[in-house]
Amino acid sequence: MMTGTIETTGNISAEKGGSIILQCHLSSTTAQVTQVNWEQQDQLLAICNADLGWHISPSFKDRVAPGPGLGLTLQSLTVNDTGEYFCIYHTYPDGTYTGRIFLEVLESSVAEHGARFQIP
């Protein structure tokens, strides 16, 4: 039975040209995390595998940095980066957990983080 929950940074905003850290955290389970996939809508951004380490998709290599931890740092943000991001935790023996983050990239300098929230 899957007992874990994914906590994410929730709805966040950031300034155009700046950077942002996408973070998810799996809790309430003793399952082993074997891999975390990061996706932007229908694009694979990066993968962190327990054995193989990080793989960043070549088309995002200039603007995506691994970490901190299992998170992902997006750099040189553009308005086109606005949208949904997903962290997909592959675990054993539980299976797959998915967290969602919505990022809004703002033209103005007023960009505040949203509240943290949990996805069961």
């Epitope: 229908d42 694009q43 694979l44 592959h90 054993y92």
Partner: antibody
Framework: EVQLLESGGGLVQPGGSLRLSCAAS????????MHWVRQAPGKGLEWVAS????????YYADSVKGRFTISRDNSKNTLYLQMNSLRAEDTAVYYC???????????WGQGTLVTVSS | DIQMTQSPSSLSASVGDRVTITCRAS??????LNWYQQKPGKAPKLLIY???SLQSGVPSRFSGSGSGTDFTLTISSLQPEDFATYYC?????????FGGGTKVEIK
């Protein structure tokens, strides 16, 4: 240099058994998921089975479930496919392939031919 | 299971031609789509992974695009060594499934 070398194919009667092996070299075998993919004569590619790096998870195509068993010995850098209750439709070239990140198959062996016929 | 439909099943082209092969998934597979080249009597060779990433050592005339359900493999200028059969494959979920293949023949 990454190398995958299959062996164990041959002619077997329907209902018989075979064990295929895939010897891996040139990479840290224990870090990678591994797969078996087959190709019937003149046909396309069909995924058969896969196994995670630590053997924690194994997956099978419906067509072989209950008859084939995938396994690995990380100390010997070897992947196996035990094939039981073989049928004529199992006749194919069997390839082993490396599956980094469980997303793509980047290196393939040369294949070993299994022929099931009476 | 996710069905992968490739088209065309075969095509004839000349050296220097631009060739496009399409692959459609029966449900959204994000960008978990790979392309392979296979020559007679040989093992498949990975060309493109994760829809658009060029595998190391593969010539830049090969490119991939698409996401969701519709994907394309393009060879910008066909070379003599490119005459082969091409397969798409989804890795979104098990069972992994392949398209039926596209045979690229000399016109």
């Amino acid at each position: 240099e990454v190398q995958l070398l299959e062996s164990g194919g041959g002619l077997v009667q329907p209902g018989g058994s075979l064990r295929l092996s895939c010897a891996a070299s040139g990479f840290t075998f224990s870090s990678y998921s591994m797969h078996w993919v087959r190709q019937a004569p003149g046909k396309g590619l069909e995924w058969v089975a896969s196994i995670k790096s630590s053997s924690s998870n194994k997956y099978y195509a419906d067509s072989v479930k209950g008859r084939f068993t995938i396994s690995r010995d990380n100390s010997k850098n070897t992947l196996y496919l035990q094939m039981n209750s073989l049928r004529a439709e199992d006749t194919a070239v069997y390839y082993c392939a490396r599956g980094p990140y469980d997303v793509w198959l980047d290196y393939w062996g040369q294949g070993t031919l299994v022929t099931v016929s009476s | 299971d996710i069905q992968m439909t490739q088209s065309p099943s075969s095509l004839s082209a000349s050296v220097g031609d631009r060739v496009t092969i399409t692959c459609r998934a029966s449900q959204s597979i994000s960008s978990y789509l790979n392309w392979y080249q296979q020559k007679p009597g040989k093992a498949p060779k990975l060309l493109i992974y994760a829809a658009s990433s060029l595998q190391s050592g593969v010539p830049s005339r090969f490119s991939g695009s698409g996401s969701g359900t519709d994907f394309t493999l393009t060879i910008s200028s066909l070379q003599p060594e490119d005459f082969a059969t091409y397969y798409c494959q989804q890795s979104y979920s098990t069972p992994l499934t392949f398209g039926g293949g596209t045979k690229v023949e000399i016109k």
